[in-house]
Amino acid sequence: MDSFNYTTPDYGHYDDKDTLDLNTPVDKTSNTLRVPDILALVIFAVVFLVGVLGNALVVWVTAFEAKRTINAIWFLNLAVADFLSCLALPILFTSIVQHHHWPFGGAACSILPSLILLNMYASILLLATISADRFLLVFKPIWCQNFRGAGLAWIACAVAWGLALLLTIPSFLYRVVREEYFPPKVLCGVDYSHDKRRERAVAIVRLVLGFLWPLLTLTICYTFILLRTWSRRATRSTKTLKVVVAVVASFFIFWLPYQVTGIMMSFLEPSSPTFLLLKKLDSLCVSFAYINCCINPIIYVVAGQGFQGRLRKSLPSLLRNVLTEESVVRESKSFTRSTVDTMAQKTQAV
């Protein structure tokens, strides 16, 4: 989103006696930030602290196991995606504090705000990959025994990253800095100018590929997985269900406001009242989406506590237990406790 419109009302008729002192805010916005911006700043601060520390810890735990444990490969890649996005937060935070002034230049404008979209696509594609892995473990255990290896997992992750980069390119290309004449301010945002159709196309593709299609496919995928695990009376299936639902739900819940406002704005005139209202909420929607970047480590810890009873172990060992247990593939009849547990621990991805 981030198109170039933050609203102030238009007052009355031309009045030459209405000249103001240049030191006073002339567009009827005070020097205090709007409530949505303040909330966004609070969320950004929390996400940065939890996201950087949490994902760094996850990377540290999984990096050592990634050579031999496929689950570790999944969680390592997810954590890297989240960690990278968190690195942009101090800049985005600073910009909001300065009333959306962007003093960081054109390259930073193209790259940094695009990181959250890269994260969205990378996360959902990695989650789809993980879900396919879960599905195959349940329904094609013999195939998994023969072909499911670390090499294939890394290839799948590389494909997911490649596709994510490709899908982020349109937003990256249309990001520009614009310097407003009065009040003097440099803004960073997307500018499609003449091409409203292209703006709509980008928004629709983002909604479909980054939200609706994954929502549909992952819902179907996990419905089948859970029905199978229940029918086999697999142990801990309710715990599995809870974790899977929590993980899937977190992605879609936190991206929902961003996706809805984005699609609405692409179909509205930039000067319409609804558009201007949605623009006020833009930073808040972005910050809400950013919660995805810190939620996974929290889910891992909560899941780990669930499996271990009380939190008796250290955080790294707890995470190691959750993230690096390898799924044991047996005959499909004996869909093992280990597989079910691993799913619970985070099929998590979604």
Epitope: F4, N5, Y6, T7, T8, D10, Y11, G12, H13, Y14, D15, D16, D18, T19, L20, D21, L22, N23, V26, D27, K28, T29, H100, R178, E179, E180, Y181, F182, P184, K185, L187, D191, Y192, S193, P270, S271, L276
Partner: antibody
Framework: QVQLQQSGPELVKPGASVKISCKAS????????MNWVKQRPGKGLEWIGR????????RYSGKFKGKATLTADKSSSTAYMQVTSLTSEDSAIYFC??????????????WGQGTTVTVSS | DVVMTQTPLSLPVSLGDQASISCRSS???????????LHWYLQKPGQSPKLLIY???NRFSGVPDRFSGSGSGTDFTLKISRVEAEDLGVYFC?????????FGGGTKLEIK
């Protein structure tokens, strides 16, 4: 009413400098920006830069950085533009233009009558 | 810089006719406060430009109601409903949304 009275025409030699004045009346000089615009036949209108008389803050178009210098004297409500190292390319009509700043609108509303600068040896 | 493209370059009209001048910008002129700072000026021979329309569609004080402005985003139009002799001259569109403020190349309104 708002008036911007510019200094008279100038005939100057290449390499020399010229300083044009613009006396404002009929409004609070410090509360609006003063812009300078260049007009050459067949070249349209070009924004040179602006000065905020209240604090002396200036902003120039990239093309005129180092070429034009804007100043303002609050006591006499007069804005000045000095153009240096003149060439035939600088032969033009130069306008001072008030940029009105109010709670309702930002617009270049009143223009001076223009100062013709001719660069010739 | 924002490029302002005016069409036509020259507009021959008969007195009493309607005239329409188009102005297109290379970037959106919607300001971050939601307003669009697109203005129209008329410059008569030997005079300085005079403001006619500010912020797309607002007539400046003393401007007759036969002048009207419209448009949004990047496409704008100035209409003169019934051209009078005093309307002849060069019309410029201008934007003051972005740095630097820029002007269209001008449209010369002349008698057919």
């Amino acid at each position: 009413q708002v008036q911007l009275q510019q200094s008279g025409p100038e005939l100057v030699k290449p390499g020399a400098s010229v300083k044009i004045s613009c006396k404002a009346s009929g409004y609070s000089f410090s509360s609006s920006w003063m812009n300078w615009v260049k007009q050459r036949p067949g070249k349209g209108l070009e924004w040179i830069g602006r000065i905020s008389p209240g604090d002396g803050d200036t902003r120039y178009s990239g093309k005129f950085k180092g070429k034009a210098t804007l100043t303002a004297d609050k006591s006499s409500s007069t804005a000045y533009m000095q153009v240096t190292s003149l060439t035939s390319e600088d032969s033009a009509i130069y306008f001072c233009v008030r940029f009105l700043i109010t709670s309702t609108r930002y617009v270049m509303d009143y223009w001076g009558q223009g100062t013709t600068v001719t660069v010739s040896s | 810089d924002v490029v302002m493209t005016q069409t036509p370059l020259s507009l021959p009209v008969s007195l009493g006719d309607q005239a329409s001048i188009s102005c297109r910008s290379s970037q959106s002129l919607v300001h971050s406060n939601g307003n669009t700072y697109l203005h129209w000026y008329l410059q008569k021979p030997g005079q300085s430009p005079k403001l006619l329309i500010y912020k797309v569609s607002n007539r400046f004080s003393g401007v007759p109601d036969r002048f009207s402005g419209s448009g949004s985003g990047t496409d704008f139009t100035l209409k003169i409903s019934r051209v009078e002799a005093e309307d002849l001259g060069v019309y410029f569109c201008s934007q003051s949304t972005l740095v630097p403020p820029t002007f269209g190349g001008g449209t010369k309104l002349e008698i057919k």
